[in-house]
């Protein structure tokens, strides 16, 4: 426990102290006091540096004194022979004796008392920044007017913090400016502007004088600006060393002025104002900004319009422009949106044609459509080349966005017909010689394919069966072959309105207008064994002359069989109508004069016994196109005859082209258009 006073006596005092002794005393007086230690008696064996026996006085780590020998008072009025004054409240006294004493020594007697210390003057380090006040057992610090004592109870500073500036313009100065600023102070000023405005600080060099930096370059007094995670400064010295205009890019700024105890100067003065937050003029590729300005600030709105061929894609929606607003944080809204090249996407496929997979489907890319040659050609022109246009469509120079249409090539057999042995009088043929040949199984007859959806035949073939089963693509009509070929399903049968329907068709003598069209449910796929025949043109070039040659084909009656298994064909000439009239009807069902002959009929045959016969009805009489020798057109349809192996009568197709075209147009489907 600390005590105010005390006595310390050497061992056995006042008798002689023993040899080989080491004893220590720890003196402690209350905090705020020093210790006055004085000796009234001292009789210790003398030695150099008190090496043998001694009394040692230690304060902290410092030896205050080491005593030996005999002392007596110099003052007759005072018993004190030696004394020590320490400004600390702790002291240690250590007594040591060696192994022998030549004489008898009585040791020492000492006393200590607590003494007041003057903290304000007794120490090298002044405890108070301004005023120090001593009292018995302690001290306190005090401050001049307008200063306040900090929590450490030692330092004084000015009350210069806590100011918040919210006006868009203002002036801030150090305390007492232009008089010297207070020492030992930390001044914090806050500028808080509305979001969207940045604090801009303006200083003049001459309005700044702050204690200069030390030799290491560290500011002793400093001015610092903090804006979010950005810091400007610290600044110090004579004349402002930083930029005279500080754009903080923030609506919040903290100004911190820190001073130490020495070297006060006049300080500083600054102005600030709020600038609308600028947004950078960003380089957005492939676009135009409207309005165009040198500088954009908070609340400015721009319309960013993509150049032709570019679009902004947000989710699944493509647009050509978007709006962006300069936001309070100095960033543009919608900054993620970009003008990307328009993507026309995978080009649509077309029926009976193809488009190569494009390397790119972006703006400017080029694709080419082709038709499945040689069976289809591009009907609507344009060359099939399309480019990806700015509107996101594949566009052709001629057709625009309309897709090309691949339509069947007509009248071109894959293999030309060559007459072999005479068979009534015909030759074996292959379906590739007559790819337009259609087989009707009930009644056994023929027809001609004229496009993907239509079959041309004789009216008498379909008058008794409005749902005929037809086949294309097979040379043989053996069942196993037909099972492998293409079966055609009718949707509707259109018989020419001029064809007279009879109660008893077997007794017919009038075959005028013997023509019908069958509309198919599904389009026919063309190929080497299935391909349409052309229709005649309406010009006089397509008027047949006597002797003009035509080809007939079918599975009708031959000399050997009632029905042919494999396709037969013959080449025969056009003959005058009278030649057909002159032939006697083989099995007349009426008077010979009753048979009707009209200009709607073509007479052909009579040469080498080549003729069509029962079962060939409806098949085409195919003639070489006068304007394109590579093609055949259906000049006639096998209709009737007086006698197989002589002359036969064929419906003159040229007379019905208008009816055919009208019927097809009126009964087409959207798919076909």
């Amino acid at each position: 426990e600390p005590t105010m006073y005390g006595e310390i006596l050497s061992p056995n005092y006042p008798q002689a102290y023993p040899s080989e002794v080491e004893k220590s005393w720890d003196i402690e007086v209350p905090e705020g006091y020093g210790i006055h230690l004085y000796f009234t008696h001292l009789d210790i064996e003398l030695s150099e540096n008190c090496a043998y026996d001694s009394v040692q006085i230690i304060s902290g780590d410092t030896e205050e004194g080491r005593l030996c020998g005999q002392r007596s008072s110099n003052n007759p009025h005072s018993p004190i022979v030696e004394e020590f004054q320490v400004p600390y409240n702790k002291l240690q006294v250590i007594f040591k004796s060696d192994f022998s004493n030549e004489e008898r020594f009585t040791g020492f007697a000492a006393y200590y008392v607590a003494t007041d210390i003057n903290e304000c003057t007794d120490f090298v380090d002044v405890p108070c920044s301004h005023f120090c006040n001593n009292f018995i057992g302690g001290y306190f610090c005090s401050c001049p007017p307008e200063y306040f004592l900090h929590d450490d109870m030692k330092n004084c500073g000015v009350n210069c913090s806590g100011d918040v500036f919210t006006a868009l313009i203002g002036e801030i100065a150090s305390p007492n400016y232009p008089k010297p600023y207070p020492e030992n102070s930390r001044c914090e000023y806050q500028i808080r502007l509305e979001k969207g405005f940045q604090v801009v600080v303006t200083l003049r060099r001459e309005d700044f004088d702050v204690e200069a930096a030390d030799s290491a370059g560290n500011c002793l007094d400093s001015l610092v600006f903090v804006a979010g995670d950005r810091q400007f400064g610290p600044y110090c010295g004579h004349g402002f060393p930083g930029p005279l205009n500080i754009e903080t890019k923030s609506n919040a700024l903290d100004i911190i002025f820190q001073t130490d105890l020495t070297g006060q100067k006049k300080g500083w003065k600054l102005r600030y104002h709020g600038d609308p937050m600028p947004c950078p003029k960003e380089d957005t590729p492939n676009s135009v900004w409207e309005p165009a300005k040198a500088k954009y600030v908070f609340r400015d709105v721009v319309q960013i319009t993509c150049l032709d061929g570019f679009e902004v894609v947000e989710g699944r929606v493509g647009a050509t422009s978007f709006y962006s607003t300069c936001q309070s944080n100095g960033k543009w809204s919608n900054s993620k949106l970009k003008c990307q090249p328009v993507d026309c996407g995978i080009p649509e496929s077309i029926e009976n044609g193809k488009v190569e997979d494009p390397e790119s489907t972006l703006f400017g890319s080029v694709i080419r459509y082709t038709c499945e040659e040689p069976y289809y050609y591009m009907e609507n022109g344009g060359g099939g080349e399309y480019h990806c246009a700015g509107n996101g469509s594949w566009v052709n120079e001629v057709l625009g966005p309309e897709l090309p249409k691949c339509v069947p090539v007509c009248g071109v057999p894959r293999e030309p017909f060559e007459e072999k042995q005479r068979i009534i009088g015909g030759s074996d043929a292959d379906i590739k010689n007559f790819p337009w040949q259609v087989f009707f199984d009930n009644p056994w007859a023929g027809g001609a394919l004229i496009n993907e959806y239509w079959v041309l035949t004789a009216a008498h073939v379909v008058e008794g069966n409005r749902e005929p089963t037809m086949y294309v693509g097979s040379t043989s009509v053996q069942t196993s072959r037909l099972a492998k070929s293409k079966m055609l399903t009718p949707e509707h049968v259109f018989i020419h309105p001029g064809w007279k329907l009879l109660e008893v068709p077997e007794g017919r003598t009038n075959f005028d207008n013997d023509i019908a069209l069958v509309r198919l449910k599904d389009p026919v796929k063309m190929g080497p064994t299935v391909s349409p025949i052309c229709l005649p043109g309406t010009s006089s070039d397509y008027n047949l002359m006597d002797g003009d040659l035509g080809l007939i084909s079918g599975w009708g009656r031959t000399e050997k069989r009632d029905r042919a298994v494999r396709l037969k064909a013959a080449r025969l000439p056009v003959a005058p109508l009278r030649k057909c009239k002159e032939v006697k009807v083989e099995k007349p069902t009426a008077d010979a004069e009753a048979y009707v002959f009209t200009p709607n009929m073509i007479c052909a045959g009579g040469e080498k016994g080549m003729d069509s016969c029962k079962g060939d009805s409806g098949g085409a009489f195919a003639v070489q196109d006068p304007n394109d020798k590579t093609k055949f057109y259906a000049a006639g349809l096998v209709s009737w005859g007086p006698q197989c192996g002589t002359y036969g009568l064929y419906t003159r197709v040229k007379n019905y082209v208008d009816w055919i075209m009208k019927t097809m147009q009126e009964n087409s489907t959207p798919r076909e258009d």
Partner: antibody
Framework: EVQLVQSGAEVKKPGASVKVSCKVS????????MHWVRQAPGKGLEWMGT????????IYAQKFQGRVTMTEDTSTDTAYMELSSLRSEDTAVYYC????????????WGQGTLVTVSS | DIQMTQSPSTLSASVGDRVTITCRAS??????LAWYQQKPGKAPKLLIY???SLESGVPSRFSGSGSGTEFTLTISSLQPDDFATYYC?????????FGQGTKVEIK
């Protein structure tokens, strides 16, 4: 009118071969496609194969592949079916049949030839 | 090869009965199906071809229906001459196959 006349009944030992003929009258073999069908006693009909004149190849049922040979002699309008490595289960009536036209499977059947395989 | 499954294998019926025999193909055969009637010791006789077409000379009491994989032969009113074995046959592929047969016997 097409008619098919088949060769007479045969009795064969297991392991032997049999050749059944089928003569066409009223038409030429070149215009026809001949099929062969057999029927074991009390059992169902079993298609064996055919010559396809369009492709010029003979098609056999998997079951008979390697054991059956179908040939034609167009000069005599006769079709032949030879079955080798006979076993008792080959005992059956063997029919030649002409393929039909325009969706009819078979037109004319021969009268059948009974082949008996017995040791 | 295409398998043909006929049912029932045996059918007992009386004169005047309506009889139905079904045939199922293991894959689609479109309408390429025929029905035959066979009497003991005779070659089969074609009744129906292309699933529903009646062969000429065959009584109209016989009818066929179906397409794809399911087919039916119907005898609207069974006659004494109709007791026989009936076979279905597919000819969609060159490798023709028959059903195992349905024997129609007197009840």
């Amino acid at each position: 009118e097409v008619q098919l006349v088949q060769s007479g009944a045969e009795v064969k030992k297991p392991g032997a071969s049999v050749k059944v003929s089928c003569k066409v009258s009223g038409d030429t073999l070149t215009e026809l496609s001949m099929h062969w069908v057999r029927q074991a006693p009390g059992k169902g009909l079993e298609w064996m194969g055919t010559f396809d004149p369009e492709e010029g190849e003979t098609i056999y049922a998997q079951k008979f592949q390697g054991r059956v040979t179908m040939t034609e002699d167009t000069s005599t309008d006769t079709a032949y079916m030879e079955l080798s490595s006979l076993r008792s289960e080959d005992t059956a009536v063997y029919y030649c049949v002409t393929e039909g036209l325009a969706g009819r499977p078979y037109d004319v059947w021969g009268q059948g030839t009974l082949v008996t395989v017995s040791s | 090869d295409i398998q043909m499954t006929q049912s029932p294998s045996t059918l007992s019926a009386s004169v005047g009965d309506r009889v139905t025999i079904t045939c199922r193909a293991s894959q689609s055969i479109s309408s390429w199906l025929a029905w035959y009637q066979q009497k003991p010791g005779k070659a089969p006789k074609l009744l129906i071809y292309k699933a529903s077409s009646l062969e000429s000379g065959v009584p109209s009491r016989f009818s066929g229906s179906g397409s794809g994989t399911e087919f039916t032969l119907t005898i609207s009113s069974l006659q004494p001459d109709d007791f026989a074995t009936y076979y279905c046959q597919q000819y969609n592929s060159y490798k023709l196959t028959f059903g195992q047969g349905t024997k129609v016997e007197i009840k």
